[in-house]
Amino acid sequence: QAGPLPKPTLWAEPGSVISWGNSVTIWCQGTLEAREYRLDKEESPAPWDRQNPLEPKNKARFSIPSMTEDYAGRYRCYYRSPVGWSQPSDPLELVMTGAYSKPTLSALPSPLVTSGKSVTLLCQSRSPMDTFLLIKERAAHPLLHLRSEHGAQQHQAEFPMSPVTSVHGGTYRCFSSHGFSHYLLSHPSDPLELIVSGSLEDPRPSPTRSVSTAAGPEDQPLMPTGSVPHSGLRRHWE
C-alpha cells in the first residue's frame, strides 16, 4: 500500500512580511498529479481558497491584490490527487505591517559606540503596546521580541547589547504590536544606524539573504546580555 501523499511546499512572493495595501502571491507546489489545491488559514472557516493547478499542474497561485488585516495569519496548503488529499504543507506566517503608527527607535547613550562598551536600543510607541520587535537589516534571524508578561501594555522596550562588537553594527528598525494578533505589526520605525568604532577585528559583510532564509552557524542572532529590563516585558528569540 502506498504511503501518504508528500506534503506540498508553501511560500509567499515577494515575501511573508507585507505592508498594508501591497500585493502578495502565495504559492503552493505539490506534484504533477495534483487536480486541485486548497489553502487554509488558521482560525478561519475552511477552505480559505481553492485553485486549479497551473500547468504543468505541480503548483497553484493564490493572489492577494491588496494586503489587509483579513489576510494576515498562518496558512497551510493541500493538494488533491486521484488518490486523495495530501498531507498539509508546513505553515506559512503572513505578517502585515502598517497596522499601527510607527514607533521611534533610538540608541542610548549614542548610536556611535566603542567596541567592548554597552549600548541599549530603545523602541518607543505613542500608544501602549505589548510586543516590540527589533529587526536588523540583512540578518538571517532578524526578529527579537520583547513581550509583556501579563498583558500589561508598555510605551517602550529596551534592547541592551553588551559587550558590543563589530557584528552589532548595522541598520536597525523596530515594530510594535498588540498581543491579540502578532501577525499585525506597526509601520516600521525610521532606520537607526549603529556604528561600532575602535574595533581591531574586520567587520564582516552582512549576508544579503531574505528574512525567511534559515541561518547558517555564522549568522545566529546576537543575544543581548544583561537582565530583562524592568518593564514587565519578557524576551523571546524567534
Epitope: 472557516p45 475552511a46 480559505w48 481558497d49 481553492r50 483579513d70
Partner: nanobody
Amino acid sequence: EVQLVESGGGLVQPGGSLRLSCAASESIFSSNVMGWYRQAPGKQRELVAAVGINRLTKIGDSVKGRFTISRDNAKNSVYLQMNSLRAEDTAVYYCAAGAYVRFLQYSPDYWGQGTQVTVSS
C-alpha cells in the same frame, strides 16, 4: 438548476427569533464555506455569518451575540439562528457558498435566491 435553496424567512416581532435554513447540493456543500449575507433596502450587501468545513465560524459584528450559524453535514444544510431580532435586521437574507476569501470579497461562487426577513411590531 437551483443549487442553494433558502427557507424560514417571515415576519417577526422585535425581540423574537427566526431560524433560516439553506439546503445545498452535496458537491457544493462538502467542499465550501457556507454562509449568509443580507441586504436591506437602499443598503449595501453585508456578510452576516459563515461556517467552514472545519466548523469554524465568522459572525458579523452587527449580529455578534445574537446570531449563530451551524452546518449539518448529513443534510447538506446550513442554518442561521437569529435571536433578539431588531428592526434593523429587516432585509433579504441570501445563502451563499464558496471559498472563504471570496466571502470577504463579497463574491462567493454560489448564491441562493434570498428569503425576506421582516422585523416589525
